[in-house]
């Protein structure tokens, strides 16, 4: 048997992925366990083995279909449970009525890039990825520069409340060095979340020309 | 501002047959699912049947078989085939449209339609 308290988290990417992370204090080490999917009003049903990401903790993604598949709808309750292996039976450890469009966390943006980079300021683009069509433009961005001699929770946070894949980003010091980060977040969903942050990008203010005040 | 607009309820005899038609208009929405709900005086609306993007249609146990739900997605109109009609169908058919606007969902009803089973 396994003591302690459990926690079973999930997130639907709006598309068609369900992404899980099991917590249980106490758990058993050496022991395979599974998240199952069993739709309401769907034929399909998915499995995922759970892959551990700390000593107290497994995760795993539910491949719904094809990545820009819209698989899920408001309409739509997924049971989903963790099964872990006891001998020839599998015991449900945890169990959950998901509501995806109620746990929504989308794809980190990709593709990010310098559009054009001059002394003082940088003008930064990037994609959203497997966003639904349901939420047409209606989308609301973070996003974040890492300067000289800072942390990344040090840094103030840009709001972009409305779908703007790119970024102009004023008053920076020439010839220096930063990195950029984004993240993404529908407006739909009572427990929907920040996406996490993208891949950071890496660029370099140009000098400043010389004999030139700057 | 939202519209959702049914027609072809009424009076049929027992075993008769009646075609339901709910289409929905107004700003813009995108639309993924929509259904019918059957009210009679003294309980609450209940689902009869209704279908969500991907084709998924779910139907109340007690219709299952003599009702069929058809969705138009181009005209965002809902159709509900009723046959084999009996008098507990009767009561007032309600559609509901789940539509996104603006990034977010809510949930759009009819006026309803009057449908009489008579024995």
């Known amino acids: 048997a396994v003591n302690g308290t459990s926690q079973f988290t999930c997130f639907y990417n709006s598309r068609a992925n369900i992404s899980c992370v099991w917590s249980q204090d106490g758990a058993l080490q050496d022991t395979s366990c599974q998240v199952h999917a069993w739709p309401d009003r769907r034929r399909w049903n998915q499995t995922c083995e759970l892959l551990p990401v700390s000593q107290a903790s497994w995760a795993c993604n539910l491949i719904l279909g094809a990545p820009d598949s819209q698989k899920l709808t408001t309409v739509d309750i997924v049971t989903l449970r963790v099964l872990c292996r006891e001998g020839v039976r599998w015991r449900v450890m945890a169990i959950q009525d998901f509501k995806p469009f109620e746990n929504l966390r989308l794809m980190a943006p990709i593709s990010l890039q310098v559009v054009h980079v001059e002394t003082h300021r940088c003008n930064i683009s990037w994609e959203i990825s497997q966003a639904s069509h349901y939420f047409e433009r209606h989308l609301e961005f973070e996003a974040r520069t890492l300067s000289p001699g800072h942390t990344w929770e040090e840094a103030p946070l840009l709001t972009l409340k409305q779908k703007q894949e790119w970024i102009c980003l004023e008053t920076l010091t020439p010839d220096t060095q930063y990195e950029f980060q984004v993240r993404v977040k529908p407006l739909q969903g009572e427990f929907t979340t920040w996406s996490p942050w993208s891949q950071p990008l890496a660029f370099r203010t140009k000098p400043a020309a010389l004999g030139k005040d700057t | 501002e939202v519209q959702l607009v049914e027609s072809g309820g009424g009076l049929v005899q027992t075993g008769g047959s009646l075609r339901l038609s709910c289409a929905v208009s107004?700003?813009?929405?995108?639309?993924?699912?929509m259904g019918w709900y059957r009210q009679v005086p003294g309980k609450q609306r209940e689902l009869v049947a209704d279908?969500?993007?991907?084709?998924?249609?779910k139907y109340a146990d007690s219709v299952k078989g003599r009702f069929s739900i058809l969705r138009d997605s181009v005209k965002n109109t809902v159709y509900l085939q009723m046959s084999s009609l009996k008098p507990e169908d009767t009561g007032i058919y309600y559609c509901?449209?789940?539509?996104?606007?603006?990034?977010?969902?809510?949930?759009?009803w009819g006026q309803g339609t009057q449908v009489t089973v008579s024995s």
């Open positions: 509901k449209a789940g539509l996104w606007i603006a990034g977010r969902h809510s949930d759009y």
């Open positions: 107004g700003s813009r929405f995108i639309s993924d699912v």
């Open positions: 279908m969500a993007d991907g084709g998924s249609a």
